[in-house]
């Protein structure tokens, strides 16, 4: 009897109630591989989820998140609230990045600005809540004897004025 089940293609199931004949999956269910003894109920994209791909008899529905949310987890198993650039999501909602950190996306956490001096460079452009600092030439390159096509900007410590 096992041979009968192995002949059942995706979109069907091996129906024990009907002498293991291949029966089509019931409405709103699917089997994505052959030889299945049951079909799986189609995923429903409701609430914060929206349908990216409709369910069929051979493949599950695929969900996205509605506007203002982004996917987390395998196959978009969760939707997490978007924040603005310069913010991160906390238990109490979206909060501005602390001084010295930035987030250039609507998701994820605030990360520390790059420490230019660790690479022997100076800060060319200050960091903000939304953008990392831009590192420029090393202080040695900015010495009076160094040749440069344009006058070098004065070296500044990483950071910006508190907001």
């Amino acid at each position: 009897l096992q041979d009968l089940c192995s002949n059942c293609p995706a979109g069907t199931f091996c129906d024990n109630n009907r002498s293991q004949i291949c029966s089509p999956c019931p409405p709103n269910s699917f089997s994505s591989a052959g030889g299945q003894r049951t079909c799986d109920i189609c995923r429903q994209c409701k609430g914060v989820f929206k349908t990216r791909k409709e369910c069929s008899s051979t493949s599950n529905a695929e969900c996205d998140c509605i506007s203002g949310y982004h996917c987390l987890g395998a196959e978009c198993s969760m939707c997490e609230q978007d924040c603005k650039q310069g913010q991160e999501l906390t238990k109490k909602g979206c909060k501005d990045c602390c001084f010295g950190t930035f987030n250039d996306q609507k998701r994820g956490i605030c990360r520390p600005w790059t420490n230019c001096s660790l690479d022997g460079k100076s800060v060319l452009v200050n960091g903000t809540k939304e953008r990392d600092v831009v590192c420029g030439p090393s202080p040695a390159d900015l010495s009076p004897g160094a040749s440069s096509a344009t006058p070098p900007a004065p070296a500044r410590e990483p950071g910006h004025s508190p907001q």
Epitope: G11, N17, R18, S23, P24, C25, P26, P27, S56
Partner: nanobody, 126 residues
Framework: EVQLVESGGGLVQAGASLTLSCVIS????????MGWYRQAPGKERAFVGT???????IYSDSVKGRFTISTDDGKNTMYLQMNNLKPEDTAVYYC????????????????????WGKGTLVTVSS
């Protein structure tokens, strides 16, 4: 009472083509899937192909590329176009229709009702 009646069977040479028809009759019948099955002499009834609830058409490996299922909704008819027939296609061909007794599609409902025709014999000689 739901009735399925197959027609179009007969004796043909290997390599020939044949088209089977299945007419469904019966008031208030609504199927979510229809399929073709066959039973060769001395063997179990086997799956040929089906039109699923979302109108996918699925075939068994043994007939894929040679057989084509189609429907004419206006005539409540399903067809099985069989090309390049082989002696091993010799069998009684049955059509089946599947229905669910109630429309709760949020739960997986295996309380399926199936209706079968009496079959039509296809003989392929070599």
């Amino acid at each position: 009472e739901v009735q399925l009646v197959e027609s179009g069977g007969g004796l043909v040479q290997a390599g020939a083509s044949l088209t089977l028809s299945c007419v469904i009759s019966g008031r208030t019948f609504s199927s979510y899937a229809m399929g073709w099955y066959r039973q060769a002499p001395g063997k179990e009834r086997a799956f040929v192909g089906t039109i699923t609830w979302n109108n996918d058409i699925i075939y068994s490996d043994s007939v894929k590329g040679r057989f084509t299922i189609s429907t004419d909704d206006g005539k409540n008819t399903m067809y099985l176009q069989m090309n390049n027939l082989k002696p091993e296609d010799t069998a009684v061909y049955y059509c089946a229709a599947y229905s669910v007794p109630y429309g709760d599609f949020c739960t997986l409902n295996y309380d399926l009702m199936d209706y079968w025709g009496k079959g039509t014999l296809v003989t392929v000689s070599s």
